[in-house]
């Protein structure tokens, strides 16, 4: 359930605060990498590799680091100020409407269509009609209609952190 809450979900109204690390809150807020103590008088550091906070905040605890699922690779580890960045393995992608899992990219386009976009960690291959150039709906084609192609190489890492 760690993915259910990010600091964006919990973020209070953003207030400007001086950008230096302090052991006591500045204007009631603690710097990234810290949370506020129960009595509101101290800033307590998050535990490296366990939890984090990304903004100046008055959260009473740090947020849990995301653990990359099987089928994902860790692009960058969790630090006290940044959540783990996970990315789908080559040949798989994560859609916006189903962010909880990586799905296999299609291996090719349906008959009468050409591939114009490779498989990336955040998108399936993109197909368009040969004549009209209009995009395919994204439905997985029947096997016998498939024109095979190899999955593309990720163009750039996709940050999924909060």
């Amino acid at each position: 359930e760690s993915a259910l809450i990010t600091q964006q979900d919990l973020a209070p109204q953003q207030r400007a605060a001086p950008q230096q690390k302090r052991s006591s809150p500045s204007e009631g807020l603690c710097p990234p990498g810290h949370h506020i103590s129960e009595d509101g008088r101290d800033c307590i550091s998050c535990k490296y590799g366990q939890d984090y906070s990304t903004h100046w905040n008055d959260l009473l605890f740090c947020l849990r680091c995301t653990r990359c699922d099987s089928g994902e690779v860790e692009l960058s580890p969790c630090t006290t100020t940044r959540n783990t960045v996970c990315q789908c393995e080559e040949g798989t992608f994560r859609e916006e409407d189903s962010p909880e899992m990586c799905r296999k990219c299609r291996t090719g386009c349906p008959r009468g269509m050409v591939k114009v976009g490779d498989c990336t960690p955040w998108s399936d291959i993109e197909c368009v009609h040969k004549e009209s150039g209009t995009k395919h709906s994204g439905e997985v084609p029947a096997v016998e209609e498939t024109v095979t192609s190899s999955p593309g190489t990720p163009a750039s890492p996709c940050s999924l952190s909060g």
Epitope: P12, D58, L59, L60, R64
Partner: antibody, heavy 122, light 112 residues
């Protein structure tokens, strides 16, 4: 609509334990602390402590450490408070109440359960 | 622990008339961050408490504007501009500046 629905009244003998529950609905259960308060007959309110459903942390009023144990079942969005080694002075109505995860807005309870009367009598 | 006191402990009121409840704390409730964490609740007969005012003067959603809170330091006041029959019950002040959070003894408001 935010609702906190508590379990029914209990009658227990001295030395026994009791577990009171508080089922939350109408909001993200892991998005708020769940607090517990005690109201002795004809008396004021005392804050017992709170549970963080997000990470499992508890924070107790020192007075109730060893007396109350707070837990939750995230699968049913239910908070529990177990009171052990019951004595007559534990006879009270116990309330659950929701509070925010932030210091600045976390010290008051915006929604309360209806209360559970626990009677300790031999 | 911070001790909260309220006065009066019992307050007979006439509908349509104003009412005022005082709350005092044994120490200042001004936090080092500059905010004051003093709140008011109403417990109607046979019900659970309900939040009226938070942080001295902020009305909780749905609370009628006849309720107002004021004060600073150790002295606070809840005012009802025109009491209605539905306002009867016990009013509690509460502080969350200092751990543990504590409540006042309550003020019972009843119709004369």
């Amino acid at each position: 609509e935010v609702q906190l629905v508590q379990s029914g009244a209990e009658v227990k003998k001295p030395g026994a334990s009791v577990k009171v529950s508080c089922k939350a609905s109408g909001y993200s259960f892991i998005g708020y602390f769940m607090n517990w308060m005690k109201q002795s007959p004809g008396k004021s309110l005392e804050w017992i402590g709170r549970f963080n459903p997000y990470n499992g942390d508890t924070f107790y009023n020192q007075k109730f450490k060893g007396k109350a144990t707070l837990t939750v079942d995230k699968s049913t969005s239910t908070a529990h408070m177990e009171l052990s080694s019951l004595r007559s002075e534990d006879t009270a109505v116990y309330f659950c109440g929701r509070s925010a995860y932030y210091f600045d807005s976390g010290g008051y309870f915006d929604y309360w359960g209806q209360g559970t009367l626990v009677t300790v009598s031999s | 622990d911070i001790v909260m006191t309220q006065s009066p402990l019992s307050l007979p009121v006439t509908p349509g008339e104003p009412a005022s409840i005082s709350c005092r704390s044994s120490q200042s409730l001004v936090h080092s961050n500059g905010n004051t964490y003093l709140h008011w609740y109403l417990q109607k007969p046979g019900q659970s408490p309900q939040l009226l005012i938070y942080k001295v003067s902020n009305r909780f959603s749905g609370v009628p504007d006849r309720f107002s809170g004021s004060g600073s330091g150790t002295d606070f006041t809840l005012k009802i501009s025109r009491v209605e029959a539905e306002d009867v019950g016990v009013y509690y002040c509460s502080q969350s500046t200092h751990v543990p959070w504590t409540f006042g003894p309550g003020t019972k408001v009843e119709i004369k």
